[in-house]
């Protein structure tokens, strides 16, 4: 098995992940593994020398960087919070704070904004990934209601009066629950029909 450094006349290396082409010497050299950087570049007679990233710095991939990249905190002013700390092999992992969504994306989220309220009679459509986009409000399905303006309130099923031994006084709507009454209670005058004899 050929180990770096080795000559390459066609500008390609055998292991595309762990080697890179050094065009001045026409050789393939080792990249440094995640968590390390190049402390001494390769030559025709000596392979790359790697060193571990210092605290508060990282390199995520096989690389031939001569520095490690500085860890950056999640910016709360931009609505971000930390879900995993920076390590020598991985940058700080951030997400939008609860009740916010990602409004600006450049390889990762850079700016979060407050989720829009959904008006009464609607709820936010459930997303695959929390914080990925703003709310898309959809009407409550039949037999359900939601009576607030809220970014997170869910439509609830209408109360079934009969389950409580009651009778329906007023049907539920998308914005209000069913109104129930005691069977013994008389209907208000405006609701009782006039009987003609």
């Amino acid at each position: 098995q050929v180990v770096p450094p080795y000559g390459s006349e066609n500008q390609t290396c055998r292991d595309q992940e762990k080697e890179y082409y050094e065009p001045r010497h026409r050789i393939c050299c080792s990249r440094c593994p995640p968590g390390t950087y190049v402390s001494a570049k390769c030559s025709r007679s000596r392979d790359t020398v790697c060193a571990t990233c210092a605290e508060n710095s990282y390199n995520e991939h096989w690389n031939y960087l001569t520095i490690c990249q500085l860890c950056r905190p999640c910016d709360p002013v931009m609505g971000l919070e930390e879900i995993a700390p920076c390590t020598s092999k991985r940058k700080t992992q951030c997400r939008c704070q609860p009740g916010m969504f990602c409004a600006a994306w450049a390889l990762e989220c850079t700016h979060c904004e407050l989720l829009s309220d959904c008006p009464p009679g609607t709820e936010a459509e459930l997303k695959d990934e929390v914080g990925k986009g703003n709310n898309h409000c959809v009407p409550c399905k039949a037999g359900h209601f939601q009576n607030t303006s809220s970014p997170s309130a869910r439509c609830q099923p209408h109360t079934r009066c009969e389950d409580q031994g009651l009778v329906e006084a007023a049907p539920g709507t998308a914005q209000s629950d069913t109104t129930c009454r005691n069977p013994s209670e008389s209907l208000p005058p405006e609701m009782s029909g006039t009987m003609l004899m």
């Epitope: 890179y20 990249r31 390199n59 995520e60 991939h61 096989w62 690389n63 031939y64 001569t66 990249q69």
Partner: nanobody, 117 residues
């Protein structure tokens, strides 16, 4: 995947100038070294110029003082300004980028430069 598209090649008289461009598109992000190579008719591909991610440039002896490599990181583009062209500069010119901070090496399709009277 990253795509590289070269442009600017053509027929030019000896002593003339051309400017080659190589624009990267697709999932192009990270830290890159950028190169221009050329392949004269019937010969092997050879390195012409280097632009490293650290801002250093380097040239083949045969083009020193005549060719200039530059890059516009905002436009994801690398250029090769070729002055005082000679018949022996006739070749297909290829741009090549190699990602420094992660695996990745990409080639353009090449652009033909012909120097002839």
């Amino acid at each position: 995947e990253v795509q590289l598209v070269e442009s600017g090649g053509g027929l030019v008289q000896p002593g003339g100038s051309l400017r080659l461009s190589c624009a990267a598109s697709g999932r192009f992000f990270g830290i890159y070294d950028m190169y221009w190579y050329r392949q004269p008719p019937g010969k092997q591909r050879e390195l012409v110029a280097i632009s490293t991610s650290g801002g250093h440039t380097n040239y083949a002896d045969s083009v020193k003082g005549r060719f200039t490599i530059s890059r516009d990181n905002a436009k994801n583009t690398v250029y090769l300004q070729m002055n005082s062209l000679r018949p022996e500069d006739t070749a297909v010119y290829y741009c090549n980028i190699q990602r420094v901070d992660a695996p990745g090496m990409y080639w353009g399709q090449g652009t033909l430069v012909t120097v002839s009277s």
